[in-house]
């Protein structure tokens, strides 16, 4: 439905508050280095302009596309070249190339200071003094650090952020009320950002077909009672929503997401019995709730898949009729029967089935050729099952911190060229799979673990893409989206790696480590562990464990000493010497 003025259309659909918030998110995700005040000014100018278009859709410039309007506004920033360098060249381009250019310059790891949480009283005062600015600042700080954050979901986070301050700043013990809520929002926010980053990578690097296949599998698991046609409609709509958000079209994305939630709730009966509670909530909560809703129960007495996809003599005829529809039906039927499989496993099975049909439907006797196709699935299913079993056993034996350390060593040996901060961040996140998924029963372990690992490995892929240093990482990241995890799992020690020169400074520690939080202290120790492996890639587990135990004892001893700094200096030298001897450095 064509509108005379797109900006007026979106302003009316979304309302002023959401319109302003989404424009701020869009601008902060594009110009990640710009000061808050500059963005607020730009947003206010866009909002005033939108209001003139609402009043008169025929007014000057109101017929321009949102990309044109927003791009023109971003290109008025005076310090564009000084701050962003070659991104300023985007402004010489016309739409749609200009927007594509801005998208290409989004930085997954912007050089921004870590967000330090002020004292609770300071935050509460700021919240009470100017609630609107306080919440805008939250949107700005998250959006610029997470340039692919799912914008309508960030509105939901902001709503919860506001609710936390509204409640806790009146509480008797403000800190006890607020801090756990902020920790939860931070952790959920990081997880949400990483999940959305994978969706955008899927669309941008592997195309719409790859995303749609993922969505068919996931929605079929979630809504196993829904007909294939219903799932297909939801997939089409969901693909549009995520294509828009990943493309920076945040107003359209939020609007379409609201429409999709409305449709789902109006058609619950033909989608899922689990949606009732979600559909009673306000819009932002409703959309979030639908996105997280548990899988519905599988219909009773589903027939064997073999009848339609192996035994039928019309398999090749049906495949020829509409390849993607037939493969989509296969994926739908397989996924709705297997909530116990990861989405990536289901996609591997569908790919195997497709490859088999491509080969066998060309044969003189196709059925003879594809009769045993389901037998080919067995090893594909067993591989992640065995891997998860082994790693959950290791996690239960070691606990999270030591399990992370085992993964740090494993991944540093696989891809030692990757930067130490990236290896630490990714391995720590990989290690969290244990506490996240190993507690689940067998039937929920694989979808939890392998789909989570896909999200974490995508973080490695996007960080590595910015500064590529390892052909092995590039290969695993680009060859196949669904085989990334098996690709990384299959990597052995990189025998071509030349060990890093020993640098004593890397292993010099100071008294400031004693005042760090437990998490920060772990990161310091894990950073040292990665560096150790980079120096001595052939070190055994036992050697590394001995050095790390000595290191932990050294930190504990010096943090208890009266003269901490002297202790770190003197004992540190001894530790470095002992470690060098132990590892033969």
């Amino acid at each position: 439905d064509a509108h005379k003025s797109e900006v007026a259309h979106r302003f009316k659909d979304l309302g002023e508050e959401n319109f302003k918030a989404l424009v701020l998110i869009a601008f902060a995700q594009y110009l990640q280095q710009c000061p808050f005040e500059d963005h607020v000014k730009l947003v206010n100018e866009v909002t005033e302009f939108a209001k003139t278009c609402v009043a008169d859709e025929s007014a000057e410039n109101c017929d321009k596309s949102l990309h044109t309007l927003f791009g023109d506004k971003l290109c008025t920033v005076a310090t564009l070249r000084e701050t962003y360098g070659e991104m300023a060249d985007c402004c010489a381009k016309q739409e749609p190339e200009r927007n594509e250019c801005f998208l290409q310059h989004k930085d997954d790891n912007p050089n921004l200071p870590r967000l330090v949480r002020p004292e609770v009283d300071v935050m509460c005062t700021a919240f009470h003094d100017n609630e609107e600015t306080f919440l805008k600042k939250y949107l700005y700080e998250i959006a610029r650090r997470h340039p692919y954050f799912y914008a309508p979901e960030l509105l939901f986070f902001a709503k919860r952020y506001k609710a936390a301050f509204t409640e806790c700043c009146q509480a008797a013990d403000k800190a006890a009320c607020l801090l756990p809520k902020l920790d939860e929002l931070r952790d959920e926010g990081k997880a949400s950002s990483a999940k959305q980053r994978l969706k955008c990578a899927s669309l941008q690097k592997f195309g719409e077909r790859a995303f749609k296949a993922w969505a068919v599998a996931r929605l079929s698991q979630r809504f196993p009672k829904a007909e294939f046609a219903e799932v297909s409609k939801l997939v089409t709509d969901l693909t549009k929503v995520h294509t828009e958000c990943c493309h920076g079209d945040l107003l359209e994305c939020a609007d379409d997401r609201a429409d999709l939630a409305k449709y789902i709730c109006e058609n619950q009966d033909s989608i899922s019995s689990k949606l009732k509670e979600c559909c009673e909530k306000p819009l932002l909560e409703k959309s979030h709730c639908i996105a997280e809703v548990e899988n519905d129960e599988m219909p009773a007495d589903l027939p064997s898949l073999a009848a339609d996809f192996v035994e039928s003599k019309d398999v090749c005829k049906n495949y020829a009729e509409a390849k993607d529809v037939f493969l989509g039906m296969f994926l739908y039927e397989y996924a709705r029967r297997h909530p116990d499989y990861s989405v990536v496993l289901l996609l591997r099975l569908a790919k195997t089935y497709e490859t088999t049909l491509e080969k066998c439907c060309a044969a003189a006797d196709p059925h003879e050729c594809y009769a045993k196709v389901f037998d080919e699935f067995k090893p594909l299913v067993e591989e992640p099952q065995n891997l998860i079993k082994q790693n959950c056993e290791l996690f239960e034996q070691l606990g999270e911190y030591k399990f992370q350390n085992a993964l740090l060593v494993r991944y540093t040996k696989k891809v030692p060229q990757v930067s130490t901060p990236t290896l630490v961040e990714v391995s720590r996140n990989l290690g969290k799979v244990g506490s996240k998924c190993c507690k689940h029963p067998e039937a929920k372990r694989m979808p939890c673990a392998e789909d989570y690992l896909s999200v974490v490995l995508n973080q490695l892929c996007v960080l590595h893409e910015k500064t590529p240093v390892s052909d092995r990482v590039t290969k695993c990241c680009t060859e196949s989206l669904v085989n990334r995890r098996p690709c990384f799992s299959a990597l052995e020690v990189d025998e071509t790696y030349v060990p890093k020169e020993f640098n004593a400074e890397t292993f010099t520690f100071h008294a400031d480590i004693c005042t760090l939080s437990e998490k920060e202290r772990q990161i310091k120790k894990q950073t040292a562990l990665v560096e150790l492996v980079k120096h001595k890639p052939k070190a055994t587990k036992e050697q590394l464990k001995a050095v790390m135990d000595d290191f932990a004892a050294f930190v504990e001893k010096c943090c208890k000493a009266d003269d901490k700094e002297t202790c770190f200096a003197e004992e540190g030298k001894k530790l470095v010497a002992a470690s060098q001897a132990a590892l033969g450095l």
Epitope: C316, A362, H367
Partner: nanobody
């Protein structure tokens, strides 16, 4: 939309010959094995002959071996069945199908009678 159009059928005397052709559209013909199947009056479907996508593998039912020859032209998206030494028991409606599937077309009538 997959479409298969058979032609070339007719009335022929025993011992005579016919050439059936099938023109395909709506799918990547060169990627699929094809077959001829037939249905005699009051009987079920019978598979006659099959050919792989590249034409290298040809197979025949015992009842037609040595008399019928299947071939294809991927450039023209055409499947052919050359039928020699025809017998009355070859009387049937002949269909071309993808793989060894069920017919989805009108077929072409072959009648062998003196």
């Amino acid at each position: 939309q997959v479409q298969l159009q058979e032609s070339g059928g007719g009335l022929v005397q025993p011992g005579g010959s016919l050439r059936l052709t099938c023109t395909a559209s709506g799918f990547t013909f060169r990627s699929f094995g094809m077959s001829w199947v037939r249905q005699a009056p009051g009987k079920g479907l019978e598979w006659v002959s099959a050919i792989s996508a590249d034409g290298s593998d040809k197979r025949y039912a015992d009842s037609v071996k040595g008399r019928f020859t299947i071939s294809r032209d991927n450039g023209k998206k055409m499947l052919t069945l050359d039928m020699n030494s025809l017998k009355p028991e070859d009387t049937a409606v002949y269909y071309c199908v993808i793989g060894r599937g069920s017919p989805a077309s009108q077929g072409t009538q072959v009648t062998v009678s003196s």
